[in-house]
């Protein structure tokens, strides 16, 4: 019994005066607490308590469940205890089978003994299975068996408390350990699509997948820069132990333009947090935006190829595409394809392949595209660069020499005079008149230029050269002059191709 100095309050004394007492089942438990300031007896087993205000605790017929710690407390709050074992061969263990362990922490298997004199108090696996090799435990007959540093691998471990009694192994009821994993990484989050484009009134639905070791992971959909509560629905699965998946689906049944923005799926556990975002754009109606990939004014040399290429954004999907020239629709020579195979792709490419273009094939080429909401078009003005062609070269009745040339770009006509037998005509002659004539062909056809000089200026035999040229090439025509007396005659004009 405790002893204290005189004058100080002393703890109560208990009879019988021992720390442990063993009684047989059916026998009487009689405990006396002596203290002038007696307050109460408290009985505790498996962390449950009962109180008694009588200073003598009497249990006439002891049962195994009367095993436990009996504590007498006085008015000064001082106490004294005795532990009573009620030996019952038919009930060697008192149990509370709730058994949870936090990974890396200790946990108590609550199976206190009713008989402290049994031996080999330990844990055993169910159905004769061995315990994990690294499982360490510390037995305490009054509390149970403490498993040290619970491992994740112990989850759903089935075990019994065990003792040897009279040479036989006796097992308690079965315990199943439920391990709560420690979070050792942030949750893994992913989203069904990174961006959404909708028309007003359409349903917006996006799913976030959260993966972690347990369902204790927290997740939510948040709208960036907003505190508005979002409506979510959940599905969850345990793919075996410590492999938990949750799908959080956010739905806006009828999206409005002002619902546009960034939505974040956020998840956290005690280790940290992770998030992923998706962008919603809601438009009041569909659209088509066309972007030419080349200049809409195109110059191409005669006989060469050119590709007219557009990219366009279309939402909803494009339904009709066509290329048109001179009110005629191309049935081939063009292709249309999505810019990417991504499910949320709204960008497309259309290419018209023009091959070996002739001078007569210049003009406006138009790409038209439509969807259920809008139509859009873009025009390319194609100019075919052609070497000048001399259409006419004549001596007119009024004595003028006239040269008419066609080509694109607009040809320039220069005149040269070659006296006598000289091969090279270098002396230039200024024209009297130069006119650009209206072509009867399409507006993108060749340009016709007419130039005239006065032949009376020539006093000697020789050759007059009319040279038409542009960026593409040049062509010449010649007038030969011979004088007979005072008369000048034009003898056979001829052209000479000059590359």
């Amino acid at each position: 019994q405790p002893s204290v100095s005189p004058g100080e309050p002393s703890p109560p004394s208990i009879h019988p005066g021992k720390s442990d007492l063993i009684v047989r089942v059916g026998d009487e438990i009689r405990l006396l607490c002596t203290d002038p300031g007696f307050v109460k007896w408290t009985f505790e087993i498996l962390d449950e308590t009962n109180e008694n205000k009588q200073n003598e605790w009497i249990t006439e017929k002891a049962e195994a469940t009367n095993t436990g710690k009996y504590t007498c407390t006085n008015k000064h709050g001082l106490s004294n205890s005795i532990y009573v074992f009620v030996r019952d061969p038919a009930k060697l263990f008192l149990v509370d089978r709730s058994l949870y362990g936090k990974e890396d922490n200790d946990t108590l298997v609550r199976c206190p003994l009713t008989d402290p004199e049994v031996t080999n108090y330990s844990l055993k696996g169910c159905q004769g299975k061995p315990l994990p090799k690294d499982l360490r435990f510390i037995p305490d007959p009054k509390a149970g068996i403490m498993i040290k540093s619970v491992k994740r691998a112990y989850h759903r471990l089935c075990l019994h408390c065990s003792v040897d009694q009279e040479g036989k192994s006796v097992l308690s009821e079965k315990f199943i350990l439920k391990v709560r994993p420690a979070f050792k990484a942030v949750p893994v989050v992913s989203v069904s699509k990174a961006s959404y484009l909708l028309r007003e009134g359409e349903e917006f639905t996006v799913t976030c997948t959260i993966k972690d070791v347990s369902s204790s992971v927290y997740s939510t959909w948040k709208r960036e820069n907003s505190q508005t509560k979002l409506q979510e629905k959940y599905n969850s699965w345990h793919h075996g132990d410590f492999n938990y998946e949750r799908q959080a689906t956010l739905t806006i049944s009828s999206a409005r333009v002002n619902d546009s923005g960034v939505f974040m799926c956020y998840a956290n556990n005690t280790f940290g947090s992770a998030n992923v975002t998706t962008t919603l754009e809601v438009v009041d109606k569909g659209f088509i935006n066309i972007f030419p990939m080349i200049n809409t004014t195109v110059f191409v040399n005669d006989g060469e190829n050119v590709d007219l290429i557009v990219e366009y954004e279309a939402f909803p999907k494009p339904e009709h595409q066509q290329w048109i020239y001179m009110n005629r629709t191309f049935t081939d020579k063009w292709e249309d394809y999505p810019k990417s195979e991504n499910e949320s792709n709204i960008r497309y490419v259309s290419e018209l392949h023009l091959t070996r273009l002739k001078g007569t094939e210049g003009g406006t080429y138009t790409f038209l595209v439509s969807n259920s909401d809008v139509n859009a078009a873009i025009a390319f003005n194609v100019y075919v660069n052609t070497k000048p062609e001399i259409l006419t070269y004549d001596r007119l009745v009024n004595g003028m020499l006239q040269c008419v040339a066609a080509g694109f770009p607009e040809p320039t006509i220069d005149w040269y005079f070659c006296p006598g037998t000289e091969q090279r005509c270098s002396a230039s002659v200024l024209p009297v008149d130069v006119q650009t004539l209206n072509s009867s062909g399409p507006p993108f056809g060749k340009l016709v230029v007419q130039s005239s000089i006065d032949s009376s200026a020539f006093k000697h035999n020789g050759t007059v050269e009319c040279k038409a040229y542009n960026d593409v090439g040049k062509t010449s025509a010649y007038f030969n002059f011979a004088f007979k007396g005072n008369n000048k005659e034009q003898i056979h004009p001829h052209t000479l191709f000059t590359p």
Epitope: D96, S98, Y100, N105, C158, R180, S215, S216, H238
Partner: antibody, heavy 117, light 111 residues
Framework: QVQLVQSGAEVKKPGASVKVSCKAS????????MHWVRQAPGQGLEWMGV????????SYNQKFKGRVTMTTDTSTSTAYMELRSLTSDDTAVYYC??????????WGQGTLVTVSA | EIVLTQSPSSLSASVGDRVTITCRAS??????????MHWYQQKPGKAPKLLIY???NLESGVPSRFSGSGSGTDFTLTISSLQPEDFATYYC?????????FGQGTKLEIK
């Protein structure tokens, strides 16, 4: 003997928070898990979550996602359940329940929370 | 989550009748042959009261006319001879894995 005594009825406005208490006696408070269960009028029982014995870590039903917090005060052997951003759907009787030997062996008497504008 | 479906949802019976309520789980609630299924009784305005734990164990203080059976996904609560005080709502509950779930309830009424 084990007893769980809960705080009295509450009337709250939508958007407000409520904190229900559950005072335990008759056992070592820190040795047992405490669960919270609610029951809407005329409806069934719904598990909200648990605060585990020992270290006091929690596990919540995802349905209450971030709106619920369960805590304990070991000095007074009291468990608390706070629910935020209340709506009319949160009108219910809220129960605390002690887990003993794998089952909910002891229940509080319940706390009616009414959410009304 | 594990979904528990009780049948019937309501039931009319007379004093002395034998009554059976079933609870079906969407997946097994067993671990090593132990069924983490429990039955509760609830009367209007009162907290639920535990009747049967771990599928077939009678809670201390509960009359022996109550019994439970089953394993895996199919469970039964039986009242062998109905007494007037047994008219109440009965719930099954699983705690094999979180979130713990309850059946929707079976209301037992006097015929």
């Amino acid at each position: 003997q084990v007893q769980l005594v809960q705080s009295g009825a509450e009337v709250k406005k939508p958007g407000a928070s409520v904190k229900v208490s559950c005072k335990a006696s008759g056992y070592t408070f820190t040795s047992y898990n405490m669960h919270w269960v609610r029951q809407a009028p005329g409806q069934g029982l719904e598990w909200m979550g648990v605060i585990y014995s020992g270290q006091g870590d929690t596990s919540y039903n995802q349905k209450f996602k971030g709106r619920v917090t369960m805590t304990t005060d070991t000095s007074t052997s009291t468990a608390y359940m706070e629910l935020r951003s209340l709506t009319s759907d949160d009108t219910a009787v809220y129960y605390c329940a002690r887990e003993r030997d794998t089952r909910f062996g002891n229940w509080g008497q319940g706390t009616l929370v009414t959410v009304s504008a | 989550e594990i979904v528990l479906t009780q049948s019937p949802s309501s039931l009319s019976a007379s004093v002395g009748d034998r009554v059976t309520i079933t609870c079906r789980a969407s997946e097994s609630v067993d671990i090593y042959g132990e069924s983490f299924m429990h039955w509760y009784q609830q009367k209007p305005g009162k907290a639920p009261k535990l009747l049967i734990y771990l599928a077939s164990n009678l809670e201390s203080g509960v009359p022996s006319r109550f019994s439970g059976s089953g394993s895996g996904t199919d469970f039964t609560l039986t009242i062998s001879s109905l007494q007037p005080e047994d008219f109440a709502t009965y719930y099954c509950q699983q705690n094999r894995e979180e979130p713990y779930t309850f059946g929707q309830g079976t209301k037992l009424e006097i015929k």
